[in-house]
Amino acid sequence: KNLKSPQKVEVDIIDDNFILRWNRSDESVGNVTFSFDYQKTGMDNWIKLSGCQNITSTKCNFSSLKLNVYEEIKLRIRAEKENTSSWYEVDSFTPFRKAQIGPPEVHLEAEDKAIVIHISPGTKDSVMWALDGLSFTYSLVIWKNSSGVEERIENIYSRHKIYKLSPETTYCLKVKAALLTSWKIGVYSPVHCIKTTVENELPPPENIEVSVQNQNYVLKWDYTYANMTFQVQWLHAFLKRNPGNHLYKWKQIPDCENVKTTQCVFPQNVFQKGIYLLRVQASDGNNTSFWSEEIKFDTEIQAFLLPPVFNIRSLSDSFHIYIGAPKQSGNTPVIQDYPLIYEIIFWENTSNAERKIIEKKTDVTVPNLKPLTVYCVKARAHTMDEKLNKSSVFSDAVCEKTKPGNTSK
């Protein structure tokens, strides 16, 4: 009896694992084996596919074959007993195009109100993704074990921290990788669960803000308790994207080590141009808080957001304020590359009652003032871009007296 060729051959490639599956054509014939050949583009001869010769099952693995994953290959299969079937040719394919990204490896660390997720590719030193290793991004689905309500987080890198969680609560998550450059979305990892710890005695510092004063950066934060010491650390933001890096070498800011106030001042030259992450930790001598949420700090934006410089022309019932570019040292104006909005605060010198004006224009009228009265004015700039959402510190207050009653024109 003639053996029939196997049918319905499927090629599954996940990372560097190459699996072939097929259907027997004739279930009634026993003791049949199957063998594959392969052919590279531009070659006439067929080569035996190692790992897929004389196979008794309907599945084989040819991962050991060292292929150029960007080169098209063709496969053929036949059945063998005493005689052999005709060859069945599988549609040619390029391994890289066919490959799926496997489930990533996930490692979790717990704090009281946060979880740190470390993600790495499921296959170490993968041949398939050798040129794309730095391009992986990840997405995850997280839920409270008790509720099952899922939250999706997209476009994260090899280390991600999720904040604002509840203490002593089990959270579960699964992660998948993507190569957006190749339009590839991977397979989810198994579900990983971790319980957040009991609430820490000391909360982390909050509301960290960076501003510029003179040639210094001023870092401020809020803290619940008094008599604490704080330390501040920084990290190059790009290091978060490096998939091979599991040790994040956070560095101390020397002027911000063991400070006893909720702010510290350090020279601008501590940081070269770039984007950094900053974090703050509190200690009372016995206990230490977890680290604060990490804030992104862009020296370009920060340096540019100096408080505005302004001139006041005084009338009897109003001030005309003319806002100019802030001056750097050496009295050169700072180039403003971003659209700004200005917040102007003014008050009567003898009163604490402040009034506020928000303006996009650089010439602003402050109306409804009393004649022959001293008013003080300070201003700050805000970026209009929501993503940056930066504010300068307030300028120093400038105080001027309004003119007598007949000079309103």
């Epitope: 490692h107 979790l108 660390e109 717990a110 704090e111 009281d112 740190v116 470390h118 971790i194 710890t197 009991v198 820490n200 005695e201 890096n245 599991h246 040790l247 994040y248 070498k249 560095k251 101390q252 016995n286 206990n287 230490t288 977890f290």
Partner: antibody, heavy 118, light 107 residues
Framework: QVQLVQSGAEVKKPGASVKLSCKGS????????IHWVKQAPGQGLEWIGR????????KYAPKFQGRATITADTSISTAYLELSRLRSDDTVVYYC???????????WGQGTLVTVSS | DIQMTQSPSSLSASVGDRVTITCKTS??????VAWFQQKPGKAPKSLIY???YRYSGVPSRFSGSGSGTDFTLTISSLQPEDFATYYC?????????FGPGTKVDIK
């Protein structure tokens, strides 16, 4: 494979100094921290300090601050521990270990016995 | 400094026994705890990191659990080669510290 090989045993007089080495192979020392730990005979482990070989930043346990100095030479993948003003209770085994982020201290050297005796 | 206590300080057990060693820290250290095994005259061997993750090559009979201030190392079925001293270690904040050790010997 990853290995940390420490220098041989040392015998020193009280008040002297000793410099121990720890050579890493099978990994780039700049990508890790190297830690030093001491162990007195029959006692537990005690952390001395660590170095980031990439920029020579160090941290020390308060007890060893000023008496221990950790350095590194990345060109030969080696970290060093120098102990000054040796006392008889410094007769201990010193271990170096590789620290790898959340993987903590994953590999250890074989240890160096320092004997301080007059 | 973060203090670490271990209990028991020593225990006698037989091959096949389930052994549990506990470690307490003086403050919340999240999951930044590792466990080491040490045999006389040898360097410590790393068993567990981040509270519950086994290093590659460590047998599955070793497991770790806990978080915050209370941590446990469990050996599900004690083998002859497991008789040693076990140390816990916190790497949450400097100075890093170790527990005093738990000696596991043959009953």
């Amino acid at each position: 494979q990853v290995q940390l090989v420490q220098s041989g045993a040392e015998v020193k007089k009280p008040g002297a100094s000793v410099k121990l080495s720890c050579k890493g192979s099978g990994f780039n020392i700049k990508d890790y921290y190297i830690h030093w730990v001491k162990q007195a005979p029959g006692q537990g482990l005690e952390w001395i300090g660590r170095i980031d070989p990439e920029d020579a930043e160090t941290k020390y346990a308060p007890k060893f601050q000023g008496r221990a100095t950790i350095t590194a030479d990345t060109s030969i993948s080696t970290a060093y521990l120098e102990l000054s003003r040796l006392r008889s209770d410094d007769t201990v085994v010193y271990y170096c270990g590789r620290y790898h982020g959340y993987w903590a201290l994953d590999y250890w050297g074989q240890g160096t016995l320092v004997t301080v005796s007059s | 400094d973060i203090q670490m206590t271990q209990s028991p300080s020593s225990l006698s057990a037989s091959v096949g026994d389930r052994v549990t060693i506990t470690c307490k820290t003086s403050q919340n250290v999240g999951t930044n705890v590792a466990w080491f095994q040490q045999k006389p005259g040898k360097a410590p061997k790393s068993l567990i990191y981040s509270t519950s993750y086994r290093y590659s090559g460590v047998p599955s009979r070793f497991s770790g659990s806990g978080s915050g201030t209370d941590f446990t190392l469990t050996i599900s079925s004690l083998q002859p080669e497991d008789f040693a001293t076990y140390y816990c270690h916190q790497y949450f904040s400097y100075p890093y510290t170790f527990g005093p050790g738990t000696k596991v010997d043959i009953k």
